[in-house]
């Protein structure tokens, strides 16, 4: 069920996955929608408590029942992820937030004419996730016109505080407005030896890249294929970054692929959802549900229609004749990070991803017919 | 169900996945929508609490039931991800936020004429995710016209604070407005040895690239294929970045592929969703559901229709005759990051991704016909 309504002065009780800071409830829902498990959120609006350090907290929540009890809480804004909603989604947030200081790693500062230019700088910097701009009204004359480029490990501010004379906002990379070079190459037999900021298991390098693209700080990645000699690292997708924003060291190794985040790109292929079917591959993880369906397409649909489903494994029923309508077993699964915990082969399953995030790819994509 | 309404002064209780900071509830929902698991969010608006550090917090939430209990919370704005909504989505956010300082790593500062130019700089910088521009009204005269390019690990500000005289906003890369070079090549037998900011498992290098493209800080990636010698790294998608934004070292290794984020590109193919089916491939992860469907297409649709489903594996039923309607087993699964944790082959599964994010590709893409 798609619930677009937000509930003011209401907090969802329990189900906390994590807490981030966002400048608005709308952005909180955006974060929740893009979060692997977030189905509900509670956003602590400005003045929601006597403790300003709790303002702008965006509490991402999950529930096995996809609902949580609501409790009254002044200043809280609660709602549901848009995962269940049919409309086209966008990670592009052009809003700027006046008199809000979104805290993060201030890795760059420069004097620019206005907040738009500051946002443009952020959009055109690989590391920049959000920015704060000191306007001409900023109390400290010495800091006026200062554009601070920022990032955090999560892509959201560590905290958000009120600060007169500043404007904050997010990078517009997801708006397709970045002028940064779009590097679509995937490098086979390549390991990038930079900082691993995270690692996930992926069926292939393209999914790995989509994950990197969606990751707040991933700039490039290394993916270890099924043939990677170290069994424990097969299908491992290492999300990476570097201070320069580019890989520093490239190591040639068989059965590894590396590539770049597509976050700066104007996308002509999907980066948010992984529509492929992976044959003879099991995605393992938390079992959310097991249903009998006819075919991997129906199974994928079933997953797409399940707000908590991230991936599935379909085990066709054993056939002694070609009864194509016979149901196989469709395993609906989840994990903490939206990726299977392992990828196995040779078990007869057909694996793939929920298509719920496909609507998050841009309008251009959806009208392309398959070849 | 698609719930577009936001709930003011309401917080979703529990289900927290993470908390980020966003300048608006709209952007919070954007983040939630693009988050692999977020179905609901709570955004803490300005003045939502007495602690300004909690303002602009965007709490991403999930729930196995796709709902969470609502509690009253003054200043909170809660709502649902757009994952379940049918409309076209966009990650493009052209909004600028006046008097908001979005905190992050300030890695570049320069003097520009206005906020638009600052945003353009951000859009044309590989690392920049968002920016803050100090306007002519910024209190500190010396910092007026200063454009700060910013990034965070997550792509959202670490915190957001009120700051008079500044304007903040996001990079417009996802709006297709970046002038940065678009590098679409995927390099076989290539490992990029730069900083790993994250790693995911992907079925192929294209999914890996899409993930990198969607990742807030991924600029390039390395994907290790199924043939990668180190088994534990097979299908590993390493999301990478570097200070320069480009790979510093390229290592020739068989069975690895590398490439670049497409975030800067004007896309003619989808980058957000992964529509392919992966034969003889199992995606492993937390099991979300198992359903019997007819064919991988139905399975993928099932996944797509499941707001929480990210990818799937379809196991066709064993056939000895041509009964085409026979159902196979569709395992709907999810993980914390939307990618499989490992990918295995040889088990007869057909794997793929939910197509829910396909609608998130940009307007340009949908009007391009395939060759």
């Amino acid at each position: 069920e798609c619930v677009t309504k937000v509930f003011k002065d209401i907090s969802f009780q329990g189900g906390d996955l994590s807490t981030v800071f966002t400048p608005s409830a709308t952005y909180c829902r955006l974060v929740c929608t893009h979060h692997p498990r977030c189905l509900l959120f509670t956003f602590m609006a400005e003045s929601s408590s006597d403790d300003p350090t709790k303002w702008f907290a965006c509490i991402l929540k999950d529930s096995v029942t996809e609902i949580l009890p609501m409790v009254n809480m002044t200043g809280a804004i609660s709602g549901y992820s848009f995962k269940q909603c049919p409309q086209q989604l966008s990670t592009c947030s052009k809003d700027v937030y006046v008199n809000l200081d979104m805290k993060g790693m201030n890795y760059n500062s420069s004097v620019v004419k206005n907040a738009r230019e500051c946002q443009e700088r952020c959009t055109d910097d690989a590391h920049c996730q959000f920015f704060t701009y000191a306007t001409g009204y900023f109390p400290s004359v010495d800091h006026r016109k200062m554009c601070l480029l920022k990032y955090t490990r999560t892509g959201t501010p560590t905290t958000i505080t009120k600060l007169n004379g500043v404007v904050s906002g997010f990078s517009l990379k997801s708006c397709g407005l970045s002028n940064l070079a779009c590097i679509r190459d995937i490098f086979p037999n390549t390991v990038l030896a930079d900082l691993n900021i995270d690692s996930v298991v992926a069926p292939d390098a393209f999914v790995c890249r989509r994950i990197c693209t969606h990751h707040p700080t991933c700039l490039f990645f290394t993916f270890f294929s099924q043939a990677w000699p170290k069994e424990s690292q097969r299908h491992l997708c290492l999300l990476k970054t570097s201070e320069s924003g580019l890989p520093s060291t490239r190591i040639t190794k068989s059965h590894a692929l590396s590539g770049f985040s597509l976050q700066h790109c104007r996308h002509s292929v999907p980066v948010f959802c992984h529509p492929s079917f992976y044959n003879d591959t099991d995605f393992l993880g938390e079992e959310l549900d097991i249903v009998d369906v006819k075919g991997q397409e129906t199974c994928q649909k079933t997953c797409t229609n399940n707000a908590r489903c991230q991936f599935f494994t379909y085990y066709p029923s054993h056939r002694l004749c070609n009864e194509r309508n016979r149901r196989g077993r469709c395993y609906l699964k989840l994990s903490s990070n939206g990726s299977p915990t392992r990828i196995l082969h040779g078990r007869g399953g057909i694996s793939g991803y929920s298509l719920r995030l496909c609507k998050m790819d841009n309008v251009c994509t959806t009208k392309i017919n398959p070849r | 169900e698609c719930v577009t309404k936001v709930f003011k002064d309401i917080s979703f209780q529990g289900g927290d996945l993470s908390t980020v900071f966003t300048p608006s509830a709209t952007y919070c929902r954007l983040v939630c929508t693009h988050h692999p698991r977020c179905l609901l969010f709570t955004f803490m608006a300005e003045s939502s609490s007495d602690d300004p550090t909690k303002w602009f917090a965007c709490i991403l939430k999930d729930s196995v039931t796709e709902i969470l209990p609502m509690v009253n919370m003054t200043g909170a704005i809660s709502g649902y991800s757009f994952k379940q909504c049918p409309q076209q989505l966009s990650t493009c956010s052209k909004d600028v936020y006046v008097n908001l300082d979005m905190k992050g790593m300030n890695y570049n500062s320069s003097v520009v004429k206005n906020a638009r130019e600052c945003q353009e700089r951000c859009t044309d910088d590989a690392h920049c995710q968002f920016f803050t521009y100090a306007t002519g009204y910024f209190p500190s005269v010396d910092h007026r016209k200063m454009c700060l390019l910013k990034y965070t690990r997550t792509g959202t500000p670490t915190t957001i604070t009120k700051l008079n005289g500044v304007v903040s906003g996001f990079s417009l890369k996802s709006c297709g407005l970046s002038n940065l070079a678009c590098i679409r090549d995927i390099f076989p037998n290539t490992v990029l040895a730069d900083l790993n900011i994250d790693s995911v498992v992907a079925p192929d290098a294209f999914v890996c690239r899409r993930i990198c493209t969607h990742h807030p800080t991924c600029l390039f990636f390395t994907f290790f294929s199924q043939a990668w010698p180190k088994e534990s790294q097979r299908h590993l998608c390493l999301l990478k970045t570097s200070e320069s934004g480009l790979p510093s070292t390229r290592i020739t290794k068989s069975h690895a592929l590398s490439g670049f984020s497409l975030q800067h590109c004007r896309h003619s193919v989808p980058v957000f969703c992964h529509p392919s089916f992966y034969n003889d491939t199992d995606f492993l992860g937390e099991e979300l559901d198992i359903v019997d469907v007819k064919g991988q297409e139905t399975c993928q649709k099932t996944c797509t229709n499941n707001a929480r489903c990210q990818f799937f594996t379809y196991y066709p039923s064993h056939r000895l005759c041509n009964e085409r309607n026979r159902r196979g087993r569709c395992y709907l699964k999810l993980s914390s990051n939307g990618s499989p944790t490992r990918i295995l082959h040889g088990r007869g599964g057909i794997s793929g991704y939910s197509l829910r994010l396909c609608k998130m590709d940009n307007v340009c893409t949908t009007k391009i016909n395939p060759r």
Epitope: N179, L180, I183 | A126, S178, N179, L180, A181, D185
Partner: nanobody, 124 residues
């Protein structure tokens, strides 16, 4: 010390061809963006073509697409600009430039290292 040296300029009739070369010392084209830019008297410097050496991705200004070709020889640390079907409006000083970051490929403001330029004159 980084040095970029252009060569291959000269005078040619409209419709003719020239091949410009740019060799670098103290700077490697590998894994970096290299661009050709030009500036006519009284006009702003404009991007002509660029290449990213890692994969050979190329970028061209609309005015030269189909006529100019940029290429590289990593072993010689040299980048070339093959200019065919030259027009009088192609007359300018041509500069080779190297970047050290991911850049808008045809934006001269983002390139760090520059050569001295080589003159190209196309007469009608």
């Amino acid at each position: 010390q980084v040095q970029l040296q252009e060569s291959g300029g000269g005078s040619v009739q409209a419709g003719g061809s020239l091949r410009l070369s740019c060799v670098a010392s103290g700077y490697t084209f590998n894994n970096n963006f290299v661009g050709w830019f030009r500036q006519a008297p009284g006009k702003e410097r404009e991007g002509v073509a660029a290449i990213y050496s890692l994969g050979g991705s190329t970028y061209y200004a609309d005015s030269v697409k189909g006529r100019f070709t940029i290429s590289q020889d990593n072993a010689k640390n040299t980048v070339y600009l093959q200019m065919d079907s030259l027009k009088p409006e192609d007359t300018a000083t041509y500069y080779c430039a190297g970047a050290i970051t991911w850049v808008p490929p045809l934006s001269h403001r983002r390139y760090t290292y520059w050569g001295q330029g080589t003159q190209v004159t196309v007469s009608s």
